[in-house]
C-alpha cells in the first residue's frame, strides 16, 4: 500500500491579528500508527505549537476530533492571534515508539498576520 | 536573489572584541537560519554559530563563552560579537544563510557572504 | 561532535574524466523521516563556498548536472561524472544534522 504522506494544502494563511488562524493538515493513511504534532519552524530551532498526544497548549483546538482511531484530519485553530505567531508552520507524523519518532512532515503553511481593522 | 555583505573592521587588538555585521538585501531574514563560519590562513571551514529567525542561538562548543550572535530584524542584519581574541582567531569570516524545512536537521547553506577577512594583531 | 573525514586529502584529475571524493561521519546522518542530513560545497580559488549538494543526494539549484551524492548512515560519496576547468578547488562535506555544524576536512581537486 502506498507510503502515508502529509498535506497541507494551504501554502500560505492570512489572519488580522486578534482572530483565530485555521491551519489545514490531513494524512493519507492511518499506517503508521503514531500522534501528530505541529510545530512553527524547522530545524534545531523549531518550537513546538500543538502535541495531539500529550501537553497544554491553550490556544490551540483541534478542528475535527482528532482522538477518534479513524481520524485523518490534523487541522487545528490557533486563537487570538498576534504579530509574533507569523511564521511557517509544518504538521509532522510521528512513528509510535519509545520514544515517537519523526516520520514525515507536511510542506509547510506560512501565517501572516495583518493589522488588525480599525 | 539574497544578497549578503559582512562589515567590520579588519584589523582587532589581542583580548579585544571582535566586531562584525551581515546585511541581508533581496529577502526576508524570516524562516532561515543565519549563520557565521570562519576559515583560518590556509585551513578547512569552522561553524562559529547561526540565530534562527524567532532569535534562538546555537553555538560551536569550542567557542561558546566567548561569542555571541544577535539578530535585527528591522535593519535585516545579524551580527557577531567575539570575545578576548588572539592570533587564533584570525581568518576570513563569513555570514551565510541555512535553510530549514524538513525536520530537525537542515537543508544547505544556500547563500553566503563574500568573506571578510579579520587579522588579529598588536 | 561528530566528526567528519574526507579523502582523498588531494586529488588530481584529468579534464573530461569522472572523479569521485569519499565522505564518513563518526555517526550516522540519516534521520527517522528518511533524509540523510549531509552536505557538500565547492571553494574555487579566491571565492567563497557554494553548495552544491544537499540532504545527501539532491542538487542545488543552477548545479550542474555531473555532479551527483549518493551514500548514506556514514558514508557518502560526490562524484563528477566528467570534471571540467571550473571544477578545480577544494569540496567539503558537512554534516547538518545536529549542532556544532562540521565540515570534512576538504578534499583539493586539481588538474592533472
Known amino acids: 500500500e502506498e507510503e502515508l504522506q502529509v498535506i497541507q494544502p494551504d501554502k500560505s494563511v492570512s489572519v488580522a491579528a486578534g482572530e483565530s488562524a485555521i491551519l489545514h493538515c490531513t494524512v493519507t493513511s492511518l499506517i503508521p500508527v503514531g500522534p501528530i504534532q505541529w510545530f512553527r519552524g524547522a530545524g534545531p530551532a523549531r518550537e513546538l505549537i500543538y502535541n495531539q498526544k500529550e501537553g497544554h497548549f491553550p490556544r490551540v483546538t483541534t478542528v475535527s476530533e482528532s482522538t477518534k482511531r479513524e481520524n485523518m484530519d490534523f487541522s487545528i485553530s490557533i486563537s487570538n492571534i498576534t504579530p509574533a505567531d507569523a511564521g511557517t508552520y509544518y504538521c509532522v507524523k510521528f512513528r509510535k515508539g519509545s520514544p515517537d519518532t519523526e516520520f514525515k512532515s507536511g510542506a509547510g503553511t506560512e501565517l501572516s498576520v495583518r493589522a488588525k481593522p480599525s | 536573489q539574497v544578497q549578503l555583505q559582512e562589515s567590520g573592521p579588519g584589523l582587532v587588538r589581542p583580548s579585544e572584541t571582535l566586531s562584525l555585521t551581515c546585511t541581508v538585501s533581496?529577502?526576508?531574514?524570516?524562516?532561515?537560519?543565519w549563520s557565521w563560519i570562519r576559515q583560518p590562513p590556509g585551513k578547512g571551514l569552522e561553524w562559529i554559530g547561526f540565530i534562527y529567525y524567532n532569535g534562538r542561538t546555537f553555538y560551536n562548543s569550542s567557542l561558546k563563552s566567548r561569542v555571541t550572535i544577535s539578530l535585527d530584524m528591522s535593519m535585516n542584519q545579524f551580527s557577531l560579537k567575539m570575545t578576548s581574541v588572539t592570533a587564533a582567531d584570525t581568518a576570513v569570516y563569513y555570514c551565510a544563510r541555512v535553510r530549514a524545512y524538513s525536520g530537525i536537521g537542515l537543508d544547505g547553506t544556500d547563500v553566503w557572504g563574500q568573506g571578510t577577512t579579520v587579522t588579529v594583531s598588536s | 561532535d561528530i566528526v567528519m573525514t574526507q579523502s582523498p586529502l588531494s586529488l588530481p584529475v584529468t579534464p573530461g574524466e569522472p572523479a569521485s571524493i569519499s565522505c564518513k561521519s563518526s555517526q550516522s546522518l540519516l534521520y527517522s523521516n528518511g533524509y540523510n542530513y549531509l552536505d557538500w560545497y565547492l571553494q574555487r580559488p579566491g571565492q567563497s563556498p557554494q553548495l552544491l549538494i544537499y540532504l545527501g543526494s539532491n542538487r542545488a539549484s543552477g548545479v550542474p548536472d555531473r555532479f551527483s551524492g549518493s551514500g548514506s548512515g556514514t558514508d557518502f560519496t560526490l562524484k563528477i561524472s566528467r570534471v571540467e576547468a571550473e571544477d578545480v578547488g577544494v569540496f567539503y562535506c558537512?554534516?547538518?544534522?545536529?549542532?556544532?555544524?562540521?565540515f570534512g576536512g576538504g578534499t583539493k581537486v586539481e588538474i592533472k
Open positions: 558537512m554534516q547538518a544534522l545536529q549542532t556544532p555544524l562540521t
Open positions: 533581496g529577502g526576508s531574514i524570516r524562516n532561515y537560519y
